[in-house]
């Protein structure tokens, strides 16, 4: 009896998982054995396919063979007992077109209302992702053991933190990766399960912000309680990115070490061109808090993001107003290359009632203005990144007589 | 293999200096903190301080902040654990330990054995 | 500073019985805690870090747990190469401390 070729063979890549499943032709037909031969793009010769060989079963794993993920590879599988089948042939297919992306690994560490997730690529240097590692990004599903309300975080890097959260609360979550570059979405990790601590003594410091005086950057922080002693570390933004190592090297700011009030002011100069993270940490001698919320923070836009510079071109029942680019020192404009939104305050002059416009456009219409009426406005900039959050303090306030009736045109 | 293979046993007098040295191997100490930890006889384990051998920052427990220095040198992967003015308490087994992932101690060297006595 | 204690300085048990080392921070560590094996003329080995993760290669009848205060290494069906003494130590704030160790005696 002729040996009918497999049918239906299915090709699974997982990171560096490669796996051939297919369906046996003739299930009555007993002692079959599988086997593949692989074609390389611009060959004619058909090699065989180690590990997948004289197979039994119907699946079997060639992830012991060195491919180039790049390029295109054939397959083609025939049946053998004593006599064997004709070859079937697969569809090409190019490896790293076809791969998955695997479960992650992940690992918790807990606080008393805060998560910390390390995340790592499932497989470790992997062949598949080799020059794709700094590219990943994650996004997780979490949630109250008790409740199973989902909440979904898109857009985390290797290092992630949740704050906010109960203490002595079971949470759960699961995480996948992704390639944005590649349009890959990976298959989510097994779900991690942690519990937040008891309730810490001493709470984080809260509220921290960064502002620029003079060749000083002013870091200011809140605190609850009086005669505490803060220590300021700062770690580069991109190290959370770094995908195998997890360890983060965080470095003092020298003059914010034991500092007993809650601000403290250093030289612009400890820090160089970049972004960065910070966060903040208070004693009491015997006891200690968790690290604050770390907070972003980005050297360009905190030396330069300052008020905007504006014209207001007055009609009667309305201001236009055209925004340009602030300017330093010896009158040159200050190039702004991150996109930001604009708050602009107007008020009548005789009174204390404020309007405000937020607008990302930089000519603006301020309307329903009573004509012969003086109006003040001041403007301020804040940036789009949420993530940055930061804004520039307001312009000094402009003030304008709206013209007269029927100007309108 | 990650190895961290320590200087052999001193024995100097009281008063003396003493440097002792931890070599690394199958990992760059660049990329790492590497710890020094005190071990006297039948006691616990007390943690000196750490070096960041990237930048040289470094970190000490109080007691032990004026009596060691710490340093390193990146381009023969060795850290160092220098002692001033010792006295027989500074008698113990001195493990180099490579700080890992999270920060946790994840490879310990073999242990110097340093004894001060005239 | 942080104090670990180890409240039992020594343990017996006997071959593939369990026993359970505790260690209590003098303050909340979170999950910052790690374990290590000490055999008798050698140098410590890491068996858990962060509370309850396993260092690769080490025997799953290690178990770590606890947060906040409280943490205990459970070593399920003890062996005889198990005797030893055991540590626990934080590592959220400097200095690093250690708990004063637990040593485990086989009868």
């Known amino acids: 009896k002729n040996l009918k070729s497999p049918q239906k063979v299915e090709v699974d890549i997982i990171d560096d998982n490669f796996i051939l499943r297919w369906n046996r032709s003739d299930e009555s037909v007993g002692n079959v054995t599988f086997s593949f031969d692989y074609q390389k793009t611009g060959m004619d010769n058909w090699i065989k396919l180690s590990g997948c060989q004289n197979i039994t079963s119907t699946k079997c794993n060639f992830s012991s063979l060195k491919l180039n993920v790049y390029e295109e590879i054939k397959l083609r599988i025939r049946a053998e007992k004593e006599n064997t089948s004709s070859w079937y042939e697969v569809d090409s297919f190019t490896p790293f077109r076809k791969a998955q992306i695997g479960p992650p690994e992940v690992h918790l560490e807990a606080e008393d209302k805060a998560i910390v997730i390390h995340i790592s690529p499932g497989t470790k240097d992997s062949v598949m992702w080799a020059l794709d590692g700094l590219s990943f990004t994650y996004s997780l599903v979490i949630w109250k053991n008790s409740s199973g309300v989902e909440e979904r975080i898109e857009n985390i890097y290797s290092r992630h933190k949740i704050y906010k959260l109960s203490p002595e609360t079971t949470y759960c979550l699961k995480v996948k990766a992704a390639l944005l570059t590649s349009w890959k979405i990976g298959v989510y990790s097994p779900v991690h399960c942690i519990k937040t601590t008891v309730e810490n003594e001493l709470p984080p410091p809260e509220n921290i912000e960064v502002s620029v005086q003079n060749q000083n950057y002013v870091l200011k922080w809140d605190y609850t309680y009086a005669n505490m002693t803060f220590q300021v570390q700062w770690l580069h933004a991109f190290l959370k990115r770094n995908p195998g190592n997890h360890l983060y090297k965080w470095k003092q700011i020298p003059d914010c070490e034991n500092v007993k009030t809650t601000q403290c002011v250093f030289p612009q100069n400890v820090f160089q061109k970049g972004i960065y993270l910070l966060r903040v940490q208070a004693s009491d001698g015997n006891n200690t808090s968790f690290w604050s919320e770390e907070i972003k923070f980005d050297t360009e836009i905190q030396a330069f993001l300052l008020p905007p510079v504006f014209n207001i071109r007055s009609l009667s029942d309305s201001f236009h107003i055209y925004i340009g680019a602030p300017k330093q020192s010896g009158n040159t404009p200050v190039i702004q290359d991150y996109p930001l939104i604009y708050e602009i305050i107007f008020w009548e002059n005789t009174s204390n009632a404020e309007r405000k416009i937020i607008e990302k456009k930089t000519d603006v219409t301020v309307p329903n203005l009573k004509p012969l009426t003086v109006y003040c406005v001041k403007a301020r900039a804040h940036t789009m990144d949420e993530k940055l959050n930061k804004s520039s303090v307001f312009s000094d306030a402009v003030c304008e007589k709206t013209k007269p009736g029927n100007t309108s045109k | 293999e990650v190895q961290l293979q320590q200087s052999g046993a001193d024995l100097v007098r009281p008063g003396a200096s003493v440097k002792l040295s931890c070599t690394a191997s199958g990992f760059n100490i660049k990329d790492y903190y590497i710890h020094w930890v005190k071990q006297r006889t039948e006691q616990g384990l007390e943690w000196i301080g750490r070096i960041d051998p990237e930048d040289g920052e470094t970190k000490y427990a109080p007691k032990f902040q004026v009596k060691t220095t710490i340093t390193a040198d990146t381009s023969s992967n060795t850290a160092y654990l220098q002692f001033s003015s010792l006295t027989s308490e500074d008698t113990a087994v001195y493990y180099c330990v490579r700080g890992g992932n999270f920060y946790y101690f994840d490879y310990w060297g073999q242990g110097s054995t340093l004894t001060v006595s005239s | 500073d942080i104090v670990m204690t180890q409240s039992q300085k020594f343990m017996s048990t006997s071959v593939g019985d369990r026993v359970s080392v505790t260690c209590k921070a003098s303050?909340?560590?979170?999950?910052?805690v790690a374990w290590y094996q000490q055999k008798p003329g050698q140098s410590p080995k890491a068996l858990i870090y962060?509370?309850?993760y396993r260092y690769s290669g080490v025997p799953d009848r290690f178990t770590g747990s606890g947060s906040g205060t409280d943490f205990t290494l459970t070593i399920s069906n003890v062996q005889s190469e198990d005797l030893a003494e055991y540590f626990c130590?934080?590592?959220?704030?400097?200095?690093?401390?250690f708990g004063g160790g637990t040593k485990l005696e086989i009868k």
């Open positions: 303050q909340n560590v979170g999950t910052n």
């Open positions: 130590q934080q590592c959220i704030n400097y200095p690093y401390t």
């Open positions: 962060s509370a309850s």
